[in-house]
Structure formats: structure tokens, C-alpha cells
């Protein structure tokens, strides 16, 4: 069909044609001119705007020997892979003398099978949990109607009758595939097939069942896992960072977590080899044949204090008259808590045992009753925490002090002369 009128003085003897096709099409638009004298540069316009970076070539053919003879000029604009942005009205423009000439227009249009702007993506979802899938397609030609398919079965009676850009799935109990068909006047395009993998739901109600200094027993309630039974659950424990630790839902902690697997059921696990009196964070995830659930939030827990695991070390006891000097060092064995102090017990062969709470000092001077003639006096020391006493040391006999033997620097503690003893708080 005619497109405008060739201007009387127009040098154009050929105008751009029409290109209509599907995306990716390659085509060429041409302008042909016959001019007298020096040939002009041909510019290309799209929708009236000069194309600065056009992929164009210009060929000039002289029709005579003389400079002033006619020339044929052919400018070719190549469209390498047709896109929506290429569509529009194309014209050639030349400047000849003081005049501007524009060719008749040609049109580039996009028309073909629907083109997907968005396709459903593979994803994992928890069993029985709602989610949405997206699909978007365009022509031209419009309209484009979508038809969703689940496991290759259409979810509507006809294209355009069911959900369009977004498909709401109320929940799945088995791994399924979803795709979408885009229909227009030119035909049908099918999207990629997205696999939606059904994983177990996140476990709930992670809690402590019992606590011991080096062990915690925890339990949880499993989430739904669709048609796939749970194979095991994985529990992670990590040392909290000075009690500041990980807030619920924060990223993974920096330290390598202690990981344990639990056969299920029961949904319970004893976590051993922990540090006493230590804050931890724990979380759990459960796994089916389809993969693991998401982790629960980190739950802060703490092991209780234990009693020291060994007696104080290097106990020495010397006697000088009615005084006895006793000193010792902190147990080498784990304290399993915060050391609150030491208890000391001494006893003669025929006298009752005397118990003392020394506090955190590691030496004591005892004022012995009477003239110091008590025979076979022995001393025992134990460390204690809030959880109780650690083991007592073996009895250390009181040695007689020899001149020249160094005496410990200490604060003299004078014990009451009465044999009565006030038992400590424990």
C-alpha cells in the first residue's frame, strides 16, 4: 500500500520496506537515492529521531565519468536480532544543498509467538504452605492468554480463564512441576517447567527436657512433611558469644557448630560433651527424602554449673606450736563453674573433725586448741562452686615446723577455742 507521497524534488528512488516478524529475526531496511553531484550522507530515523549508533552501510555508485553526473546511493540498515525496542517507523534523511529530504516511512513491527518476560522458577516450599508462582508473556499480537499446568495437567478449562500472571498455590504435599502456556493469535509458547520441591515444615517448640553440666536433653515437635516421612533431624549447638550470642533468626554463628543427628521418632536428643555452666544456642531442622526443612530460630540454653572435678593441688600443712600453716593451689581438674571458695577439714586422732569455709583464699593459719599436743593431725581441702563441693583431697598430715623453713605470708586466722563449729550454708 502507498505510504505518503514522494516529494517532487526528492532524490529518493527507494524507501524502507516493512519488517514484521518474531523476536530474533534479522532483516535489512534500505534507502535508494539518485542524486546529481556529490552524494550526501544518509541518516536513519526511527520515529523521527536520528539513530546515532545505527548498524548501517552506505554504498555509492557513479553513473558517469564526470563529478557532476548522477550517483546512486544505497544505504542499508541492518537489524540483527529484532527486539521490541527496534519497532517503529523508519525513514532516511539527507541534506542536499540547503534542503532536507526524508524518505517515505517503513515500519518495523514485532509479531510472533508469545515471548516470556517471566517464567516460573524452581523453588522449595514447606509442605502445606501457600506460595505464588509468576508467569508473564507478551506479543505482539496481543492479547496473550496464559494457561497454568500442574504436573502437565491444565489448571483451567481454557487459556485466559484461570489465573494469569500470578498463580496462588494453597499448599502442596508432594513435589510437583508447574509450567505456563502463553496463547496468542500466532500460536502457543510453553514456559520452562519449574520443579517445586516439598520440604518438611520447620520443627516447632524446640525446648529443654533436662540439663546436666555437660549434657542437655532437648525435644521438639516435627512439622508436616507431606507424603515424605522424615528420615532424621539434625541439631546444632554453638557456644554463645559471651552470652551476647545469636539473636533469634540472625545469620549463622561464626564458630563451627556442634552437629548431632537424631533418628526419628522420638523427636528428642541428648547432647553430650558440652561445657558446664556455658551458654549455648541450639537449633533443629528435619529432613525427608526431598531435603531438609529450614532451621528453627536459635534457642538460647545454658548448661548448669557442676562441682569441681578434682581436689585442690599441692597442699602443704606445717605446725609450729599451737599454730598450723596450710596452703594449696586451685584444682587442675575442671571447676565446672565459678569457684566460690574452699572448705578445709582437720582432725586429730582422738578429736572430732573441724570444718571451715575458707572463702577464695588459698592459705590459712589455724590456731590449734590446747597446747598443741593433739597427735596425728591431718588436713583435707575441697573446692566448691554453687553446685556443691568437689572431691576432698587426701588427708595431708601436719608436719612439724623446722627452723629455717619459710613461713607463708598470711593473715592470722584465730579459730574460736570452743570446739563448737557452725556448719556452712550448704
Amino acid at each position: 500500500a502507498p505510504r505518503g507521497t514522494q516529494a517532487e524534488e526528492s532524490p529518493f528512488v527507494g524507501n524502507p520496506g516493512n519488517i514484521t516478524g518474531a523476536r530474533g529475526l534479522t532483516g535489512t531496511l534500505r534507502c535508494q537515492l539518485q542524486v546529481q553531484g556529490e552524494p550526501p550522507e544518509v541518516h536513519w530515523l526511527r520515529d523521527g529521531q536520528i539513530l546515532e549508533l545505527a548498524d548501517s552501510t552506505q554504498t555509492q555508485v557513479p553513473l558517469g565519468e564526470d563529478e557532476q553526473d548522477d550517483w546512486i546511493v544505497v544505504s542499508q540498515l541492518r537489524i540483527t536480532s529484532l527486539q521490541l525496542s527496534d519497532t517503529g517507523q523508519y525513514q532516511c534523511l539527507v541534506f542536499l544543498g540547503h534542503q532536507t529530504f526524508v524518505s517515505q516511512p517503513g515500519y518495523v513491527g514485532l509479531e510472533g509467538l508469545p515471548y516470556f518476560l517471566e517464567e516460573p522458577e524452581d523453588r522449595t516450599v514447606a509442605a502445606n504452605t501457600p506460595f505464588n508462582l509468576s508467569c508473564q508473556a507478551q506479543g505482539p499480537p496481543e492479547p496473550v492468554d496464559l494457561l497454568w499446568l500442574q504436573d502437565a495437567v491444565p489448571l483451567a478449562t481454557a487459556p485466559g480463564h484461570g489465573p494469569q500472571r500470578s498463580l496462588h498455590v494453597p499448599g502442596l504435599n508432594k513435589t510437583s512441576s508447574f509450567s505456563c502456556e502463553a496463547h496468542n493469535a500466532k500460536g502457543v509458547t510453553t514456559s520452562r517447567t519449574a520443579t517445586i520441591t516439598v520440604l518438611p515444615q520447620q520443627p516447632r517448640n524446640l525446648h529443654l527436657v533436662s540439663r546436666q553440666p555437660t549434657e542437655l536433653e532437648v525435644a521438639w515437635t516435627p512439622g508436616l512433611s507431606g507424603i515424605y516421612p522424615l528420615t532424621h533431624c539434625t541439631l546444632q549447638a554453638v557456644l554463645s558469644d559471651d552470652g551476647m550470642g545469636i539473636q533469634a533468626g540472625e545469620p549463622d554463628p561464626p564458630e563451627e557448630p556442634l552437629t548431632s543427628q537424631a533418628s526419628v521418632p522420638p523427636h528428642q536428643l541428648r547432647l553430650g560433651s558440652l561445657h558446664p555452666h556455658t551458654p549455648y544456642h541450639i537449633r533443629v531442622a528435619c529432613t525427608s527424602s526431598q531435603g531438609p526443612s529450614s532451621w528453627t530460630h536459635w534457642l538460647p540454653v545454658e548448661t548448669p554449673e557442676g562441682v569441681p572435678l578434682g581436689p585442690p593441688e599441692n597442699i602443704s600443712a606445717t605446725r609450729n606450736g599451737s599454730q598450723a600453716f596450710v596452703h594449696w593451689q586451685e584444682p587442675r581438674a575442671p571447676l565446672q563453674g565459678t569457684l566460690l571458695g574452699y572448705r578445709l577439714a582437720y582432725q586429730g586422732q582422738d578429736t572430732p573433725e573441724v570444718l571451715m569455709d575458707i572463702g577464695l583464699r588459698q592459705e590459712v593459719t589455724l590456731e590449734l586448741q590446747g597446747d598443741g599436743s593433739v597427735s596425728n593431725l591431718t588436713v583435707c581441702v575441697a573446692a566448691y562452686t554453687a553446685a556443691g563441693d568437689g572431691p576432698w583431697s587426701l588427708p595431708v598430715p601436719l608436719e612439724a615446723w623446722r627452723p629455717g623453713q619459710a613461713q607463708p605470708v598470711h593473715q592470722l586466722v584465730k579459730e574460736p577455742s570452743t570446739p563448737a563449729f557452725s556448719w556452712p550454708w550448704w
Epitope: 502507498p2 524534488e9 528512488v13
Partner: antibody
Framework: EVKLVESGGGLVQPGGSLNLSCAAS????????MSWVRQTPEKRLEWVAF????????YYPDTVKGRFTFSRDNARNTLYLQMSSLNSEDTAMYFC?????????????WGQGTSVTVSS | DIVMTQSHKFMSTSVGDRVSITCKAS??????VAWYQQKPGQSPKLLIY???TRHTGVPDRFTGSGSGTDYTLTISSVQAEDLALYFC?????????FGAGTKLELK
């Protein structure tokens, strides 16, 4: 429907003249360049003349230059080819043809032709 | 002037065959080549222009190709109604010139 109808052909003596016409219909005549092409008895095709849509530009091959004149009347949708000094080489079937929009020198529609015989 | 040479005056073919008619220009014509079909008693009909652009209504069994000086018209599966005279033409510049024609006939 594009329609081109030539007329005015006939028998003419060498050195004589003849005027051919071409009546166009079915398209916007003033928007198209037109050409005359002839076909010799040996079936060879020869281009004879070209005229731009407004009639301001005409081109001829050397074989007819100075002897043939191509003109158009856009108001009447008619082309004219005035031929003089005819010789036996001009004996042919003469077709008027419309130039395509994409190249005026390629011809998308042709008339049925009018026969010109130059003979004594 | 640009000379267009169709080396085969005649080409024999059978219905259903693929046939290629060639045309050579005496200089580069920048793909400005048209192909015409003419049946006995009829005027020429445009098939192809700009070497490969199919004219409206032309069956897609007709395809044009080529560049520079060498051009080809291919009929992918010859039909009985395709038996005719085929001309090439350069539409680059005046004087416009045609090939001598190739007659496609039955074997």
C-alpha cells in the same frame, strides 16, 4: 485491485511517430513512479523510460533518448509515451509498469501491453 | 551500463524438483536484483526484489539469494504452474537492464 491498461499501439512506418497511453486505477497514482518496458519479438525485455511520481524527473536509455518523451497527468491517472523517429528496433510489445515503494526501479505491477510494429 | 547475464536459456525440470536459476551482473549491484516470471501471453509478474524480498502473494517456494554480482532464484519444489520464462533485472541504477531470460520447461 491495481490495474494498468495500455493503448495507442499499432503499425507505423520507419521515421513515424506514435503516442502510447496507460490508464491506471486501483491505487494512488500520484504516489508512484512509473516506467515503460518493452519486449522484443525475441522475448528480450528492455527498459524504455522512467518518470517520478510528480513527473519532475524522467530518465531514458541512450537508445531512445531524444526520440521518446514520457509524461503523466496525475489528475487523469494517465501516462503518456510520445515516440518519434521510430525504427524497426522499436518494434515490440510496450508495457507500462508501476515502481515499488522500496525501489522505484523494480516494477511490481505491469499492464497487458500494447503492440508497436515499425515496418514499411 | 550494467549487463545482466542469465547463462541458461533453458532449464529442464520435473514437478517436485528443486531448481535454481542464476544471474550474473557485470558489476556489484548491492543486492538490487529483481526476478520476474512471465507465462505465455501474459505480462511479467514480480517475484522477488532486493535479491531476497518476496513480493506480496508470491508462494514461499520461491526464494531469492545472492550478493555482489551473483544472484539465484530457487524454486524449492517445482509445480506445473511454475513452468514459465524467468527474467532477472538490476534495479540499482538507470539504465535499468534485464537478463535475456531462462525458460523453465518439463524434462
Amino acid at each position: 485491485e491495481v490495474k494498468l491498461v495500455e493503448s495507442g499501439g499499432g503499425l507505423v512506418q520507419p521515421g513515424g511517430s506514435l503516442n502510447l497511453s496507460c490508464a491506471a486505477s486501483g491505487f494512488t497514482f500520484s504516489s508512484y513512479s512509473m516506467s515503460w518496458v518493452r519486449q522484443t519479438p525475441e522475448k528480450r525485455l528492455e527498459w524504455v523510460a522512467f518518470i517520478s511520481n510528480g513527473g519532475g524527473r524522467t530518465y531514458y536509455p541512450d537508445t531512445v533518448k531524444g526520440r521518446f518523451t514520457f509524461s503523466r497527468d496525475n489528475a487523469r491517472n494517465t501516462l503518456y509515451l510520445q515516440m518519434s523517429s521510430l525504427n524497426s528496433e522499436d518494434t515490440a510489445m510496450y508495457f507500462c509498469a508501476r515502481g515499488t515503494t522500496e525501489s522505484y526501479y523494480a516494477m511490481d505491477y505491469w499492464g497487458q501491453g500494447t503492440s508497436v510494429t515499425v515496418s514499411s | 551500463d550494467i549487463v545482466m547475464t542469465q547463462s541458461h536459456k533453458f532449464m529442464s525440470t520435473s514437478v517436485g524438483d528443486r531448481v535454481s536459476i542464476t544471474c550474473k551482473a557485470s558489476q556489484d549491484v548491492i543486492t538490487a536484483v529483481a526476478w520476474y516470471q512471465q507465462k505465455p501471453g501474459q505480462s511479467p509478474k514480480l517475484l522477488i526484489y532486493w535479491a531476497s524480498t518476496r513480493h506480496t502473494g508470491v508462494p514461499d517456494r520461491f526464494t531469492g539469494s545472492g550478493s555482489g554480482t551473483d544472484y539465484t532464484l530457487t524454486i524449492s519444489s517445482v509445480q506445473a504452474e511454475d513452468l514459465a520464462l524467468y527474467f532477472c533485472q538490476q534495479h540499482l541504477s538507470t539504465p535499468l537492464t534485464f537478463g535475456a531470460g531462462t525458460k523453465l520447461e518439463l524434462k
